[in-house]
Structure formats: C-alpha cells, structure tokens
C-alpha cells in the first residue's frame, strides 16, 4: 500500500505562437482544478477505461479574472498535492491522465459550470520511494508543469511497496539478512514469503508462495526481462513466445493524437480514435456534456445538455467526488488495531496484522518471544501463538542449536551438484545450465533473454551463492 503524489507547478500558455485565449474573463471569472487518473502498466488504454490504480481531484484554485488586453499568464493553482492512494503493490510502470478543469463562476442558473480545458496523458516507469520526477506536457497551446512520486505507507517498504516492516525483536540489530526499515529505523524488514527464487527486485507476492511480476518482467520467477532480443518480426510484437515489443518507424510514432487519443496507421497517413469528449483530426477539440459520459464508476449524469451548461454526477454507493472518481476510503474508519495494515478488498475489509498480533482486527496480543532465546545469533519471530527462530546461516533446528547442511534443501536446479562452503553453498552446474543456482539454461544460439554468465565464469563452473 502507498500513495502516488502529484504536484502541479504551473499551467499556462506554452511557448511558441498561437497563445491561447484566457479561460476566464471579467464577465466570467473562473478558477481551475485538476483531476488525475492512474492505470497500471504501459498499455495504451482508452481515456474512459477505469482508473484501476486510482484517481484524485484537487481543491479549487483561487478565483481568476482576466486583465483586459493582457496575454494569458500562468493561471493561479490550487494549494496542495493530489494524492492517489493505492492498496496493492505499486506496479513500477503506470499510465496517467491529468485533466485541467475550469469552473466558471458567473451568474449561471443552477450553479457553476465546468468545462475541460486540457488533458495530457503519458506512460512512465517509477519506483516507489524514489525522488520527485519532473515533467512537462503540452495539450494544444497549453503547457502543464508537474512533479510526481510514489511512496509507501508504513509498514510497507521497497520499490513496489510489497515488503513489510515489523518491530525489532532484539534491541540492537535486525536478524540475519534483514535490513532496518528506513525511515522506521527501530523496525526491521519482515522476511519475504514469496515463491522460492522469486526475484526480489522484479517480483512480488501478497500470499505465501506467490510470484507475480512487475511490468517489464516475465517468467515463473520474474527473472526474465520482457526483451526485444528474440522478436521474430522486424516491427510489432511477437509476444506469443517472448512477450517482447519492438517499436518501429511509422506515422504513429510519437503519437500525434492529443488528449489520450489512440493512433492507427492508414495507407496514406494516420487516424486518431479520440476518447469521449474530444474530437478533431488530432483529438484537439474538447467540450464535455452528459453525452460524453463524464461520470465514472456508474455515476448518473444530470443536466449539461450542451458544453456551456453544468452537469452533476450522482455517485453510486462507495464512490464520491464531482465525477465519482474517488472510491470512498473505508479504511479511514481505522478498523485495524495495534498498527495493523487495513486492506479494502472491495467486498470486505481485511487487517494485515503486525508481528505479535492476531485476530480479525489485530486485537489479540501474542507475546510469543517473551523469555525465548535463539542460539547462535538466531532471531525470534512471533506469529501464530508459537515462537519460531529465524536462524543465522549454517544453523538450524527449533532453537538454532543444530549445525545445518546448506545443501539439504537441494538448492541447485537442473541436476547441479551442491557443495557446502564456509560462506554458504556452491552449485556446480550440469552442462547447459548456469547461474548461482543453475537456474538459467545456456542457449547455444545465444538468443536467450536471460542474463549471461558473469565475466570469467563459464557455464558449468561452480557458482557461489551467498
């Protein structure tokens, strides 16, 4: 779980000729507000498809009245960030739509009128926890400058917000292989329970034994990049075997369609398929009415028979916002006790409890580790009402008192031989395989999208797994 944050820096005329007319006038003062819609992945989706990652609406900006004869300046902006909470993993790649709306404050019958001034869209890669990313997008003669970032909500950490933190069981340090949880330095990363071998960088899980891939990665353990090396055709995807994408030159390169329109090639040129509310050769003309379906999530549109009159969205249960774009956050009721993480699954609320607590609302305190000692540097792990020791490398058993054979679990795949080593284990791979655990086949034609052997290491050489 986490939050995507968007900071609008400026909205005004773009560089070059053809400055846009000011959206407000002395007769019709107005103010701006913004809407952001997020979708996971890099796929081209229609503008009206659901904002599966979430959506948010800004506050209204200050009232602005055009000064007669003056060019349209950067318009006054609403205060604060736009925040889009996400409850699942951050996907790493995402599509966004940012809309600039005008609220006219003249003497309209029935209250203020809204109209869409500009819509920009794009696709980006972004790791959670990283710095603010800056961007500039143009829509017709308008230019929007903004920054964005994704951050995890405690106790989630990591680039996908899928690793969890838990309180330290020992005051001085975290257990073997577990790092302190920045910025919660008094907590430690909880050990991952994903499918054995699932890539910690490119895979994630929400259930024990799962391995689900972030966009751009594939394979059962999410270790294979979605690559272009094995594509068969010179243009377009050959995803049946590799999931790869090859962009090629063509009239749709750079997408000449504005406002989230999708481009398709024609024998002579290109054709834009425009999202609702836009039309024109390049989807550059806008004007939203009830006929354009501005209400999301099944909201009922009332009024707004023409672009200059207002419409109102009546939202179904569970949604709110002027366009029904916001899901009601039932987790704001804070049902989970003792620092439990609330998950709104749509059909039910669930609490993911911190270590040491259990029950549907994390109301039961389990003091499993009190008075328990794990030998040889092991760490006591609470859970399920029975203490368990997470043992340091080379030790095993209930209290970490037994010497462990690192090869007992047969970690070397594809017939590789395992050798115990003072710093861990070493796999000697069978011919045709390589990798720390012999997990990668060596394709003789060199067309594999898998990582090559490190320099100086031949397939079949023993590889140390630390």
């Amino acid at each position: 779980a986490g939050v995507f944050e968007l900071q609008i820096h400026s909205f005004g005329p773009g560089p070059g000729p053809g400055a846009p007319r000011s959206p407000c006038s002395a007769r019709l003062p107005c103010r701006l507000f913004f809407r952001v819609c997020l979708k996971p992945g890099l796929s081209e989706e229609a503008a009206e498809s659901p904002c599966a990652l979430g959506a948010a609406l800004s506050a209204r900006g200050p009232v602005y009245t055009e000064q007669p004869g003056a060019p349209a300046p950067d318009l006054p902006l609403p205060d604060g960030l736009l925040q889009v909470p996400f409850r699942d993993a951050w996907p790493g790649t995402f599509s966004f739509i940012i809309e600039t709306w005008r609220e006219e404050l003249g003497d309209q019958i029935g209250g203020p009128a809204w109209s869409l001034l500009a819509r920009v869209a794009g696709r980006r890669r972004l790791a959670a926890g990283g710095p603010w990313a800056r961007d500039i997008q143009r829509a017709g003669a308008w230019e929007l400058r903004f920054s964005y970032r994704a951050r995890c909500e405690p106790p989630a950490v990591g680039t996908a917000c899928t690793r969890l933190c838990r309180p330290r069981s020992a005051p001085s340090r975290c257990g073997p292989g577990l790092r302190p949880c920045a910025p919660l330095e008094d907590e430690c990363e909880a050990p991952l329970v994903c499918r054995a071998g699932c890539s910690p960088e490119h895979g994630f899980c929400e259930q024990p034994g799962e391995c689900r891939c972030l966009e751009g990665w594939t394979g059962p353990l999410c270790t294979v990049p979605v690559s272009t090396s094995s594509c068969l055709s010179p243009r377009g995807p050959s995803s049946a075997t590799t999931g790869c994408l090859v962009p090629g030159p063509g009239p749709c390169d750079g997408n000449p369609c504005a406002n989230g329109g999708s481009c398709s090639e024609t024998p002579r040129s290109f054709e834009c398929t425009c999202p609702r509310g836009f039309y024109g050769l390049r989807c550059e003309v806008s004007g939203v009415t009830c006929a354009d379906g501005p209400c999301f999530n099944g909201g009922l549109c009332v009024g707004g028979a023409d672009p200059d009159s207002a419409y109102i969205c009546h939202c179904p249960p569970g949604f709110q916002g002027s366009n029904c774009e916001k899901r009601v956050d039932r987790c704001s009721l804070q049902p989970c006790r003792n620092g439990g993480l609330c998950l709104d699954l749509g059909h039910a609320l669930r609490c993911r409890c911190r270590a040491g607590f259990a029950g549907p609302r994390c109301e039961h305190d389990l003091d499993d580790c009190a008075g328990r000692a794990c030998a040889n540097g092991g760490t006591c792990v609470e859970g399920g009402g029975a203490h368990r020791c997470s043992c340091a490398l080379g030790f095993g058993g209930r209290d970490c008192r037994e010497r462990a054979d690192p090869c007992a679990a047969r970690p070397c795949a594809h017939g590789g031989r395992c050798y115990a080593h003072f710093s861990g284990l070493v796999c000697a791979c069978a011919p045709g395989y390589m990798g720390a655990r012999c997990e990668f086949p060596v394709h003789p034609d060199g067309a594999s999208a898998l990582p090559a052997a490190p320099p100086g290491l031949r397939p079949g050489d023993p590889q140390r797994y630390l």
């Epitope: 599966a52 054995a196 071998g197 259930q207 391995c211 990665w217 979605v226």
Partner: antibody, heavy 113, light 112 residues
Framework: SLEESGGRLVTPGTPLTLTCTAS????????MIWVRQAPGKGLEWIGI?????STYYASWAKGRFTISRTSTTVDLKATSLTTEDTATYFC???????????WGPGTLVTVSS | DVVMTQTPSSVSAAVGGTVTINCQSS????????LAWYQQKPGQPPKLLIY???TLASGVPSRFKGSGSGTQFTLTISDLECDDAATYYC????????????FGGGTEVVVK
C-alpha cells in the same frame, strides 16, 4: 470470483471471443490462464497472460488463440474454430505459475456444422 | 513437446484407505518443483490442492500430500473419504523458447 462468458454454438471457421470477468479484485497483478476441457476428456492448457503483461501459448494454440487483458477482464480470441475446439473453456487466476487457486465455472463452446 | 504421464488412469480404494497417484514428465519441470495438483468433480472447475510440488494450498486438509522433484512426482491421499472421489490432475510449468504449462491426463479416484 471469476466468470467466463461468450460461449455459444458456432459453425466451423467462425471467430469467437470469450471473456473472463473478475469481481472483487483487479486482474492486473495476477497470472491468468485459459484452460479447456472437451466433453469427457482431460484439461488442456491454452495460454497465459502473466502479471507483467506477457503472453505465452501452448504450441498447438499459437496463431489460433490470442489472450488480452484489462484490469477487470481477460479475453480469449479464437480466429477460426473447428469441431475439435468444442469444449468447456475455463479461466483461472494464480499468484504463481504453478498454483491457480481461483477458477471460473466455465463456458461451453460448441462448434458444429 | 513435453509429455506428462499420469498413472494409473483409474484407482479404487475403500474409505479410510490410501491412494497414490504418479505423475511423470518427459522433461524436468521449471526449477525442479513447479508442479501443482488439482482435484476436479463432474460439472465443476478444478480445485487447487498442492503447488510447488509439496505445498498444501489454503484450506486443503493435510491428508493430501505431494512429493517429488524434477520429472517424478506423487500425490498421496490418506484416510480416504467419500468426498475425495474425483479426477486428479498434475500440472507442470516448463521453459522452452518462452514458458508454458501442461496437464497430465488425469486419474479417476473411486472411493468404495
């Protein structure tokens, strides 16, 4: 839950699209497979769209079937059906490639002249 | 192409007894352990029993046990109950040019 739709009686050579619709969760971060079962026969794997968006197909299904995904649906498009394609078609959700724990009830496709 | 052979095709045992189903693959499954077992009853979709060769799926009783690695796998059902009468399938994950799954031919379990 998952539910397949689009199954019907068609004539040979007809294209057909089956849709798997999810309720209660988003499909974007799960592996989704299509499997079929001819009457009185065993399960036959058609293909998968993994959580990263890549698609893979059984060797016999390449070129005959296409899988695509949105956040709430996964489609299986058949280009040209034959009588051997008569079967119940299932979609299933998995968190890993070898554990598909949520299945739809299936939709019956009958190909007959 | 990979061939997954399930034996026997049909097995009968009494309530309280034990049955063993074998699944043999013509090539090693991915990572030696990407193998799952499913139970299917007439008119119903399959139900996941075991994944990762030996890990019990949520809500599945411990009477079901999976074992094996590489190309040879076994599903053992002990303390048979009438409700266990069904067809059981193994499913392997393999690596080729891309990735793919394959199912075994199925084993019908009859409980007397």
């Amino acid at each position: 839950s998952l539910e397949e739709s689009g199954g019907r009686l068609v004539t040979p050579g007809t294209p057909l699209t089956l849709t798997c619709t999810a309720s209660g969760f988003s499909l974007n971060t799960y592996h989704m497979i299509w499997v079929r079962q001819a009457p009185g026969k065993g399960l036959e794997w058609i293909g998968i769209v993994d959580s990263g968006g890549s698609t893979y197909y059984a060797s016999w299904a390449k070129g005959r079937f296409t899988i695509s995904r949105t956040s709430t649906t996964v489609d299986l498009k058949a280009t040209s059906l034959t009588t051997e394609d008569t079967a119940t078609y299932f979609c299933a959700r998995g968190g890993s490639w070898d554990g598909f724990n949520i299945w739809g009830p299936g939709t019956l496709v009958t190909v007959s002249s | 192409d990979v061939v997954m052979t399930q034996t026997p095709s049909s097995v009968s045992a009494a309530v309280g007894g034990t049955v063993t189903i074998n699944c043999q693959s013509s090539q090693s499954v991915y990572n030696s352990d990407f193998l799952a077992w499913y139970q299917q009853k007439p008119g119903q979709p399959p139900k996941l029993l075991i994944y990762a060769a030996s890990t019990l799926a949520s809500g599945v009783p411990s009477r079901f046990k999976g074992s094996g690695s590489g190309t040879q796998f076994t599903l053992t059902i002990s303390d048979l109950e009438c409700d266990d009468a069904a067809t059981y399938y193994c499913q392997g994950t393999y690596e080729d040019v891309g990735w793919f799954n394959d199912f075994g031919g199925g084993t019908e379990v009859v409980v007397k």
